[in-house]
């Protein structure tokens, strides 16, 4: 029950996280105009991964896409790539985890297969979350660097007569959405990995010991010890007791009515 709950919760948390990563990637507010010195501005600038926007105080908003690929900073391209990889991995992870859910029965899928799929999706969620966190953090670092660079030469003038105020950008809402979403996806992935351990059938098959009583001589044949982790090739629930000392792995050559366990 706890395993199902952990798996289900991991799936839901990851689902929310990936939805957040998608939302953050699509959002226009990755960087917003710094309003520290001027809280009320007639023209407000903000930028996303795909386009930059200007909102005028009168209500008019205009967005323009980055219609160049080569002209964009390498860092921005890297952030785009990280976010897209995160989304793709997360989407595949979600697809895999749907089939892995314990509460959903698909044909005669065994628990070991579900455990494998749960682990796979968990790892995908972890990598997806890390990609998102990395992407957002790279962008945030880029913003911090540019912020202090623009602060250093905040005012550039012609003979000190005319002031040109340089627009500074600070963290936008998308960064926080991305960090939280990445974190949730990561947590969801960890939960899936934990659930996977509980799903794996813990098989400790103690093979029978055979005693062959033939006159005075006692033949002692020890059975092998096998503990299945659930990831082996032979993951069927084994029939441990089969009348005598025989197992499905090992058939005795000379069965006898005097065989005991």
């Amino acid at each position: 029950m706890a395993v199902t709950a952990c798996q289900g919760l991991g799936f839901v948390v990851s689902l929310i996280g990936i939805a957040g990563i998608i939302a953050a990637t699509c959002m226009d507010q990755w960087s917003t105009q710094d309003l520290y010195n001027n809280p009320v501005t007639a023209v407000f600038n903000y930028q996303g991964l795909w386009r930059s926007c200007v909102r005028e105080s009168s209500g008019f908003t205009e967005c323009r896409g980055y219609f160049t690929l080569l002209g964009l900073p390498a860092m921005l391209q890297a952030v785009r790539a990280l976010m897209i990889v995160g989304i793709v991995l997360g989407a595949i992870g979600l697809l895999v985890s749907i089939f892995a859910l314990k509460c959903i029965r698909i044909g005669s899928m065994e628990d070991s297969a579900k455990a494998n799929m749960t682990l796979t999706s968990g790892i995908m969620f972890i990598v997806s979350g890390l990609c998102a966190i990395a992407g957002v953090s790279v962008f945030a670092n880029m913003l911090v660097t540019n912020f202090w660079m623009s602060t250093a030469n905040m005012y550039t003038g012609m003979g000190g007569m005319v002031q040109t105020v340089q627009t500074r950008y600070t963290f936008g809402a998308a960064l926080f959405v991305g960090w939280v979403a990445g974190g949730l996806t990561l947590i969801g992935g960890v939960m899936m990995c934990i659930a996977c351990r509980g799903l794996a059938p813990e098989e400790t098959n103690y093979k029978a010991v055979s005693y062959h009583a033939s006159g005075h001589s006692v033949a002692y044949k020890p059975g092998g010890f096998k503990a299945s982790t659930g990831f082996g090739s032979n993951t069927k629930n084994k029939k441990i007791y089969d009348g005598g000392a025989r197992t499905e792995d090992e058939v005795q050559s000379y069965p006898s009515k005097h065989d005991y366990v």
């Epitope: 007639a42 600038n45 209500g59 008019f60 002031q163």
Partner: antibody
Framework: QVQLQESGPGLVKPSETLSLTCTVS?????????WNWIRQPPGKGLEWIGY???????NYNPSLKSRVTISRDTSKNQFSLKLSSVTAADTAVYYC???????????WGQGTLVTVSS | DIVMTQSPDSLAVSLGERATINCKSS????????????LTWYQQKPGQPPKLLIY???TRESGVPDRFSGSGSGTDFTLTISSLQAEDVAVYYC?????????FGQGTKVEIK
């Protein structure tokens, strides 16, 4: 097309409060515009007083901020200007105007002359 | 506050001739976000409210004749009437639409010579 019409008393006594209303037709006051008040003293230039925008936020000219209040009544599709403690220097033609793209005033009312005199 | 200074204060031009009005702002009106200059031009005829001519320094408002054009960037702007018509006699104002408070130039009166 949006049409604006100012209304209010043409004569106000010094130290009293000037109250004007702008009635909007052909559009909603809740639509994505800013609704401004601008004045023009006789024979002089234009001065922006302030605005109330689509979300109800106001912004005033700092030179008049302590005396100005702009409000709106969405049910009547009107917005209003209140200017307290008026003096003869506040005598002007008062215009209401709509600003949108480029923060430019695209629609104007015909204006109403307000004289401050005892 | 951004101070807008227009020149000349008045201008007399013959019909069909070019009229040029200058406007200078004390701060740049160029927004780096969209590379647009937030300067607007208005025409005001006697007894009428101002009429929007040009916004974003060079974008003509719909319905405005193409003889009106705006140019300039940063702090220096120009309104040009390529061929003055009798109906163009008016006072022309430039406006800072970039920074609060929105401010107007003192106006330039255009007359026929």
């Amino acid at each position: 097309q949006v049409q604006l019409q100012e209304s209010g008393p043409g004569l106000v006594k010094p130290s009293e409060t000037l109250s004007l209303t702008c009635t909007v037709s052909g559009g909603s006051i809740s639509s994505n515009y800013a609704w401004n008040w601008i004045r023009q003293p006789p024979g002089k230039g234009l001065e922006w007083i302030g605005y109330i925008n689509y979300s109800g936020n106001t912004n005033y000219n700092p030179s008049l901020k302590s005396r100005v209040t702009i409000s709106r009544d969405t049910s009547k599709n009107q917005f209003s200007l209140k200017l307290s403690s008026v003096t003869a220097a506040d005598t002007a033609v008062y215009y209401c105007a709509t600003s949108y793209y480029g923060n430019s005033f695209i629609y104007w009312g015909q204006g109403t002359l307000v004289t401050v005199s005892s | 506050d951004i101070v807008m200074t227009q020149s000349p204060d008045s201008l007399a031009v013959s019909l069909g001739e070019r009229a040029t009005i200058n406007c200078k702002s004390s701060q740049s009106l160029l927004n780096s976000g969209n590379q647009k200059n937030y300067l607007t031009w208005y025409q005001q005829k006697p007894g009428q409210p101002p009429k929007l001519l040009i916004y974003w320094a060079s974008t003509r408002e719909s319905g405005v004749p193409d003889r009106f054009s705006g140019s300039g960037s940063g702090t220096d702007f120009t309104l040009t009437i390529s061929s003055l018509q009798a109906e163009d006699v008016a006072v022309y104002y430039c406006q800072n639409a970039y920074s609060f408070p929105w401010t107007f130039g003192q106006g330039t009166k255009v007359e026929i010579k």
